[in-house]
């Protein structure tokens, strides 16, 4: 007997062909011999089966001796053997209906687990293989689990169900809720305005939740909440903000924070958390601020950086267009009795300048000028 696989919620068309290319009498019945549908002349008649309102045919095909049975909005329990009676012949078709669903929401937080559950008719023994958007294959039986979802797992998962050498394909759209970057670093000279941006890696029509930025300043013994805010339908409203520093926050997405001035006491690292409505867990993004200051006190020219710098970063002091006078993998460098001219303080990583501050050293009889 012919085997046809169907998907829950879909439509299936079972074919039945007579040898005569004309409209003749036919009937479709289920395995309990209950009539589903048939014809009376050129009109469709329906029987008392449970499929009554979901069964149909294509009358335009009857003249060619084709008498399809269409079943709409398939249910797992529609799995059965269907019999087409035409010209004193019986054609049997076994229909197996499968369903594949994500047993939680399809919008999941980064790091959470995805479980896909296969619904199948009794007596079937299907195998399932799913391919993630990044090409990772997972196999299983009735359930498939993927732990620790990553940002690259966002997108369409294609799952193939195999049964009786036949296959049916399911596509499930998964959205991994995360920030675009897990961590970011902002390098600023003392006194400059600082912009922190927290773009999301997903788009949803309505986004509601609340968030907070905790800050651990390098100079402070404990962390402190700098700002708390609410998010309602993508609109941001500040709930509470510290007096020092007085952060400003953009009213629209992406989440955007402005620190009026970069000061050494603010250098450090922060953790922005976002709790979304109806979701367990939170989204996190780490943000780091490195602040540079170049000063001249009496005969000492000093360059300092505060904040989380990697040990491989190089701090240098050099007179413009000349070789570096001093270059160290440290957070402070200085030059005694610097000669007059424009000095540059550079923070660099493998030759790439991350931060630069210029200071003008005047001849010894005058005071220094900082541009």
């Amino acid at each position: 007997k012919k085997v046809v696989l169907g998907k829950k919620g879909d439509t299936v068309e079972l074919t039945c062909t007579a040898s005569q290319k004309k409209s003749i009498q036919f009937h479709w019945k289920n395995s309990n011999q209950i009539k589903i549908l048939g014809n009376q002349g050129s009109f469709l008649t329906k029987g008392p089966s449970k499929l009554n309102d979901r069964a149909d045919s294509r009358r335009s095909l009857w003249d060619q001796g084709n008498f399809p049975l269409i079943i709409k909005n398939l249910k797992i329990e529609d799995s059965d053997t269907y019999i087409c009676e035409v010209e004193d012949q019986k054609e049997e078709v076994q229909l197996l209906v499968f369903g594949l669903t994500a047993n939680s929401d399809t919008h999941l937080l980064q790091g959470q687990s995805l479980t896909l559950t296969l619904e199948s008719p009794p007596g079937s023994s299907p195998s399932v293989q799913c391919r993630s958007p990044r090409g990772k294959n997972i196999q299983g039986g009735k359930t498939l689990s993927v732990s620790q979802l990553e940002l690259q797992d966002s997108g369409t998962w294609t799952c193939t169900v195999l049964q009786n050498q036949k296959k049916v394909e399911f596509k499930i759209d998964i959205v991994v809720l995360a920030f675009q970057k897990a961590s970011s670093i902002v390098y600023k000279k003392e006194g400059e305005q600082v912009e922190f941006s927290f773009p999301l890696a997903f788009t949803v029509e309505k986004l509601t939740g609340s968030g907070e930025l905790w800050w651990q300043a390098e100079r402070a013994s404990s962390s402190k909440s700098w700002i708390t805010f609410d998010l309602k339908n993508k609109e941001v409203s500040v709930k509470r903000v510290t007096q020092d520093p007085k952060l400003q926050m953009g009213k629209k997405l992406p989440l955007h924070l402005t620190l009026p001035q970069a000061l050494p006491q603010y250098a450090g690292s922060g953790n922005l958390t976002l709790a979304l409505e109806a979701k367990t867990g939170k989204l996190h993004q780490e943000v780091n601020l490195v602040v540079m200051r170049a000063t001249q006190l009496q005969k000492n020219l000093t360059c300092e950086v505060w904040g989380p710098t990697s040990p491989k970063l190089m701090l240098s002091l050099k007179l413009e267009n000349k070789e570096a006078k001093v270059s160290k993998r440290e957070k402070a460098v200085w030059v005694l009795n610097p000669e007059a001219g424009m000095w540059q303080c550079l923070l660099s990583d493998s030759g790439q300048v991350l931060l630069e501050s210029n200071i003008k050293v005047l001849p010894t009889w005058s005071t220094p000028v900082q541009p």
Epitope: T11, E13, S42, F43, L44, D53, D56, S57, R58, R59, S60, L61, Q64, I70
Partner: antibody, heavy 120, light 107 residues
Framework: EVQLVESGGGLVQPGGSLRLSCAAS????????MSWVRQAPGKRLEWVSA????????YYPDSVKGRFTISRDNAKNTLYLQMNSLRAEDTAVYYC?????????????WGQGTLVTVSS | DIQMTQSPSSLSASVGDRVTITCQAS??????IAWYQHKPGKGPKLLIH???TLQPGIPSRFSGSGSGRDYTLTISSLQPEDFATYYC?????????FGGGTKVEIK
């Protein structure tokens, strides 16, 4: 001879409503699924709604869902299309079409159409 | 929704010419394609359904072929009354969609 005659078209303001009718003759109306198809000026034909022979099922594309309602009166051999919240892009010639038989069959007979103009 | 791409959008031909119009579906439509002829001021007329089944009363110079996603309407020898616009229709699922039409004009 199968005949389908549409009526009820005309000029209507955006946001307004209109009800189209289609009088059917020459066949047993209650045995056929029916449809409305439209053609905007210079555009392709666009199917806008369908109804099964005994009104069990109705179908609409997303472009009109929630605004248009198809219905039929088998005793009067008439098909209707109630159009609400009309937009400029609904301006078109609206055709009443008979399906070959059921919901899944193509259109085999069409009326001559009635023009609906949505403009302020 | 299934998209139907019809080509050409217009063509000029002479009486007696062989004319071919194609329609490509965005996915397999299982031969559920119909072809219509449309003349100004009238309703469209069904020529062919189920890829190649000719409607009663339609001249045999009209024929249809194809499978999967690609389908063709052929007029073997164009007659004066055949100058019109032709549309394909997919009816594989309940959201019927038409091709953009092909206007057949006199050369």
């Amino acid at each position: 001879e199968v005949q389908l005659v549409e009526s009820g078209g005309g000029l209507v303001q955006p946001g307004g409503s209109l009800r189209l009718s289609c009088a059917a003759s020459g066949f047993t109306f209650s045995n056929y699924a029916m449809s409305w198809v439209r053609q905007a000026p210079g555009k392709r034909l666009e199917w806008v709604s369908a109804i099964s022979d005994h009104s069990t099922n109705t179908y609409y594309p997303d472009s009109v869902k929630g605004r248009f309602t198809i219905s039929r009166d088998n005793a009067k051999n008439t098909l209707y299309l109630q159009m609400n919240s009309l937009r400029a892009e609904d301006t078109a010639v609206y055709y009443c079409a008979r399906k070959y038989g059921g919901d899944y069959d193509p259109f085999d007979y069409w009326g001559q159409g009635t023009l609906v103009t949505v403009s302020s | 929704d299934i998209q139907m791409t019809q080509s050409p959008s217009s063509l000029s031909a002479s009486v007696g010419d062989r004319v071919t119009i194609t329609c490509q579906a965005s996915q397999d439509i299982n031969n559920y394609i119909a072809w219509y002829q449309h003349k100004p001021g009238k309703g469209p007329k069904l020529l062919i359904h189920y890829t190649s089944t000719l409607q009663p009363g339609i001249p045999s110079r009209f024929s249809g072929s194809g499978s999967g996603r690609d389908y063709t309407l052929t007029i073997s020898s164009l007659q004066p009354e055949d100058f019109a616009t032709y549309y394909c229709l997919q009816y594989d699922n309940l959201l019927f969609t038409f091709g953009g039409g092909t206007k057949v004009e006199i050369k």
